[in-house]
């Protein structure tokens, strides 16, 4: 598979936001790239979000997506928002070179995202 690199561990912010870079080694000059974030937990894999972008253009996720991102060359900066402690898990970056043919696929080893729910503020009189 195509080589895809991502950090091993990321700690989400207190606001439930986690960011990481997904970098891939392209065999050639792809013009259309698809990036998918998958979450693996208890051997179940679910799609978190996905975006297709043209090289040189911005990465655009669906409006209701919990992901945002920017791209620069063979690097994609991914941000996942609205995370809670129950969302802690392994987040895998999948990269597909869609055009021109041939099709190339790469799967990262995953980024373990730890999410800690903030302690509620004590009531003050």
């Amino acid at each position: 598979a195509m080589h895809v690199a991502q950090p091993a561990v990321v700690l989400a912010s207190s606001r439930g936001i986690a960011s990481f870079v997904c970098e891939y080694a392209s065999p050639g000059k792809a013009t259309e790239v698809r990036v998918t974030v998958l979450r693996q937990a208890d051997s179940q894999v679910t799609e978190v979000c996905a975006a297709t972008y043209m090289m040189g253009n911005e990465l655009t996720f669906l409006d209701d997506s919990i992901c945002t991102g920017t791209s620069s060359g063979n690097q994609v900066n991914l941000t996942i928002q609205g995370l809670r402690a129950m969302d802690t898990g392994l987040y895998i970056c999948k990269v597909e070179l869609m055009y021109p043919p041939p099709y190339y696929l790469g799967i990262g080893n995953g980024t373990q995202i730890y999410v800690i729910d903030p302690e509620p503020c004590p009531d003050s009189d």
Epitope: G28, V45, I92, K94, M98, P102, Y104, L105, I107
Partner: antibody, heavy 115, light 107 residues
């Protein structure tokens, strides 16, 4: 127009050697990983070998059935990929295809291993 | 190594029928699956790449679906020219194993 043209097939005795060539045109050869796939008579498709390109340091991969006997190589200056086949067995008989990462395929060349 | 289990090995259907061929993998291949058509005496032709994407020049009668370990090739309305053998293939990682093939015939 994309073209992959295999050559070098023929009749060879068991234990013998043969070298297949595949000439590519119509696409950027150096940007692609190249593969050899075969189909034995009455059997299905079998992937044999892959050679990656310069960004991947020309890494090579082989199926268990040919590892140690077959060698894949490429010459980007000639837009060509090769398959050196040694210690041939009768079960290596079949049509051999070269393919640019499975999107583009050649017409195939027949290799017959028989005494 | 990733094992590919393709079924059925052969099938006969009528023109206009909806036809489905399935491929199951021994582990999650994350959608890294291609489908090919091979007619006698011809080279294999890529139909579907990445489990769901239609290759250039392929009729929209063909579609692919699935994820994880279970994948399907569907022909929405069988035509006489679809008589061929169909193969799935793992393209996630080496060895890039093919399924055993499904020979499709017209009733």
């Amino acid at each position: 127009e994309v073209q992959l043209v295999e050559s070098g097939g023929g009749l060879v005795q068991p234990g013998g050697s043969i070298r297949l060539s595949c000439a590519a045109s119509g696409f950027t050869f150096s940007d692609n990983w190249m593969n050899w796939v075969r189909q034995a008579p009455g059997k299905g498709l079998e992937w044999l070998a892959q050679i990656r390109n310069k960004p991947y340091n020309y890494e090579t991969y082989y199926s268990a059935s040919v590892k140690g006997r077959f060698t894949i190589s490429r010459d980007d200056s000639k837009n060509s990929v090769y398959l050196q086949m040694n210690s041939l067995k009768t079960e290596d008989t079949g049509v051999y295809y070269c393919t640019a990462q499975f999107a583009y395929w050649g017409q195939g060349t027949l290799v017959t291993v028989s005494s | 190594d990733i094992q590919m289990t393709q079924s059925p090995s052969s099938l006969s259907a009528s023109v206009g029928d909806r036809v489905t061929i399935t491929c199951r993998t021994s582990e999650n291949i994350y959608g890294g699956l291609n489908w090919y058509q091979r007619k006698p005496g011809k080279s294999p032709k890529l139909l579907i790449y990445g489990a769901t994407n239609l290759a250039s020049g392929v009729s929209s009668r063909f579609s692919g679906s699935g994820s994880g370990t279970d994948y399907t090739l569907t022909i929405s309305s069988l035509q006489p020219e679809d008589v061929a053998t169909y193969y799935c293939q793992n393209v996630l990682r080496s060895p890039f194993t093919f399924g055993s093939g499904t020979k499709l015939e017209i009733k």
